[in-house]
């Protein structure tokens, strides 16, 4: 069975300067690939986080992706701005040259007030 | 059974305002994210607003930004939308739809209530 | 924004005919897609979300199928009580959400 991408929240509200954990989880590691977060979608969307040794400021991994048996890609966003509003989309990529996006979470609003 | 009932539609000139409401039964209100979508005569389904279950979240259409305000009342199980600043084209019937708790799509939708804005 | 594009916009048929409604989308949407039926004075109904899953009490005559961009409602043996305007929805791609212009599948 294809592998599903499940982010269970719509949205979520932040005030300004807190911290907020988008959660995705996976329904199998198969294929093989990498698993991103993106802010938007098509053309324009923004690589907000992506679980290998890449370093992303103020996006940290919630749990130890590295871990044969994870299937939870969630992630946390410090110190978060006005800026950071969106939606975000966690997303599932087949290994190959180059990778091939093949599901992808319903995605989750991130809506930010004001502290 | 899912219940949403619009009112407060009529006739309005350019530049009024006017209210309308949404009561909801049948379903645990405040536990759902709530929308205005609306039909102008003859044309399409377009959506208007959304509103999180605790009233804290709100998105707007760009068509009616800075114009119209959705709000909600959990203890009365009501849905509002004050339209301000109206225009013709925003001539239409205005639906209440219920989201799925899952996605943002509609389950339930109300009949509508027509809002006519014309000098 | 995503656009939403449906084909056609009047389809006419006879009762007990088989009605294939698309619904094209501007970019990806995966299967985050529902359709729904329309009839005057009566509340919008929702038939399919996530592109083929019926909703309560539709009969198994409409099905949905489709992914990524390309989407389709088969009604499968038209009854009269069919005959209304069709539309489609994504909600992948928000704020906003965005709807097709419809189908209206008449009696031919």
């Known amino acids: 069975t294809e592998v599903k991408v499940i982010q269970p929240e719509k949205s979520v509200s932040v005030a300004a300067g807190d911290s907020t954990v988008l959660n995705c989880t996976l329904t199998s590691l198969l294929p093989v690939g990498p698993i991103r977060w993106y802010r938007g979608v098509g053309q324009s969307r923004q690589l907000i986080y992506s679980f290998t040794t890449e370093h992303f400021p103020r996006v940290t991994n919630v749990s130890d992706a590295t871990k044969r048996s994870n299937l939870d890609f969630s992630i946390r966003i410090s110190n978060v701005t006005p800026e950071d509003a969106g939606t975000y989309y966690c997303v599932k990529f087949q290994r190959g040259s180059p990778d091939t996006e093949i599901q992808s979470g319903g995605g989750t609003e991130v809506y930010v007030l004001a502290k | 059974d899912v219940q949403l009932v619009e009112s407060g539609g009529g006739v309005v000139r350019p530049g009024e305002s006017l209210r309308l409401s949404c009561a909801a039964s049948g379903f645990t209100f405040s536990s759902y994210d709530m929308n205005w979508v609306r039909q102008a005569p003859g044309e399409g389904l377009e959506w208007v607003s959304l509103i999180s279950g605790s009233g804290e979240i709100i998105y707007y259409a760009d068509s009616v930004k800075g114009r119209f305000t959705i709000s909600r009342d959990n203890s009365k199980n009501t849905l509002y939308l004050q339209m301000n600043s109206l225009r013709a084209e925003d001539t239409a019937v205005y639906y209440c739809?219920?989201?799925?708790?899952?996605?943002?799509?509609?389950?339930?939708w109300g009949l509508g209530t027509l809002v006519t804005v014309s000098s | 924004e995503t656009v939403l594009t449906q084909s056609p916009g009047t389809l006419s048929l006879s009762p007990g005919e088989r009605a294939t409604l698309n619904c094209r989308a501007s970019?990806?949407?995966?299967?985050?897609l529902a359709w729904y039926q329309e009839k005057p004075g009566q509340a919008p109904r929702l038939l399919i979300y996530d592109a083929s899953s019926r909703a309560t009490g539709i009969p198994d005559r409409f099905s949905g199928s489709g992914s990524g961009t390309e989407f389709t409602l088969t009604i499968s043996s038209l009854e009269s009580e069919d005959f209304a305007v069709y539309y489609c929805?994504?909600?992948?791609?928000?704020?906003?959400?965005?709807f097709g212009g419809g189908t209206k599948v008449e009696i031919k």
């Open positions: 929805q994504q909600y992948y791609d928000r704020p906003p959400l965005t």
């Open positions: 970019q990806s949407v995966y299967t985050y």
């Open positions: 739809a219920k989201e799925n708790n899952r996605y943002r799509f509609f389950d339930y």
